[in-house]
Interface confidence: low
């Protein structure tokens, strides 16, 4: 029987060009975590394996950093990064636990735009 629960950072927002930490935590189970997959919709971002450590998908290696812990740090955010992210915990003997995070990447504030393009 699967007794565990996944806690996530939930719905979060960050500014374009910035970075954000995606975090999940599995609790209420004694199951052994063998691997955690981080996925964005149908794309694999990264894998953290209990024995082999981290593997970052080649297409994301310039913008994704492992950690802290089993979390994932996304860097150089773009508006296209907006969407659902999933942490998938593979455990034994329980099975698979999945957590969902929604990230919204916002344009820089109007004030910043105004200051940046102000005509002297």
């Amino acid at each position: 029987m699967m007794t565990g629960t996944i806690e996530t950072t939930g719905n979060i927002s960050a500014e374009k060009g910035g970075s954000i930490i995606l975090q999940c935590h599995l609790s209420s189970t004694t199951a052994q975590v063998t691997q955690v997959n981080w996925e964005q919709q149908d794309q694999l971002l990264a894998i953290c394996n209990a024995d082999l450590g981290w593997h970052i998908s080649p297409s994301f290696k310039d913008r994704v950093a492992p950690g802290p812990g089993l979390g994932l740090t996304l860097q150089s955010l773009t508006v296209n990064d907006t969407g659902e992210y999933f942490c998938i915990y593979h455990t034994y003997p329980d099975g698979t636990y999945t957590g969902r995070i929604f990230l919204e990447v916002l344009e820089s504030s109007v004030a910043e735009h105004g200051a940046r393009f102000q005509i002297p």
């Epitope: 024995d51 082999l52 034994y92 003997p93």
Partner: nanobody, 123 residues
């Protein structure tokens, strides 16, 4: 090309023992986790045991704990499944499989498979 070749299957009486071998080639054996699965006639393929690439971590299905032992010899590129106290319900085709991110216990997490070796436990 990855190749996994199982051997060691056969007919054995209840309570007997067998040792299955899985010879691997085509990849860096020590960087992959190895798993054993089995499929009985008319049933789905099920997880039996797995061992991490380092050999430190091992995993077993509840039905074989205490009776089966998985091991690996990196120098021989071979994984083993020592099966003791065999029961008729252990009768199945046994497959070995490799995973670069294992050890995991779902068959979908393993990318390469052997052709299988038949184990029959009967008096």
């Amino acid at each position: 090309e990855v190749q996994l070749v199982e051997s060691g299957g056969g007919l054995v009486q209840p309570g007997g023992s067998l040792r299955l071998s899985c010879a691997a080639s085509g990849f860096t054996f020590g960087h992959y986790a190895m798993g054993w699965f089995r499929q009985a006639p008319g049933k789905e393929r099920e997880f039996v045991a797995a061992i991490s690439w380092s050999g430190v971590s091992t995993y077993y299905a509840d039905s074989v704990k205490g009776r089966f032992t998985i091991s690996a010899d990196n120098s021989k590129n071979t994984a083993y499944l020592q099966m003791n106290s065999l029961k008729p319900e252990d009768t199945a085709v046994y497959y070995c499989a490799s995973s670069p991110y294992g050890p995991l216990y779902r068959s979908t997490h393993y990318y390469d498979w052997g052709q299988g070796t038949l184990v029959t436990v009967s008096s």
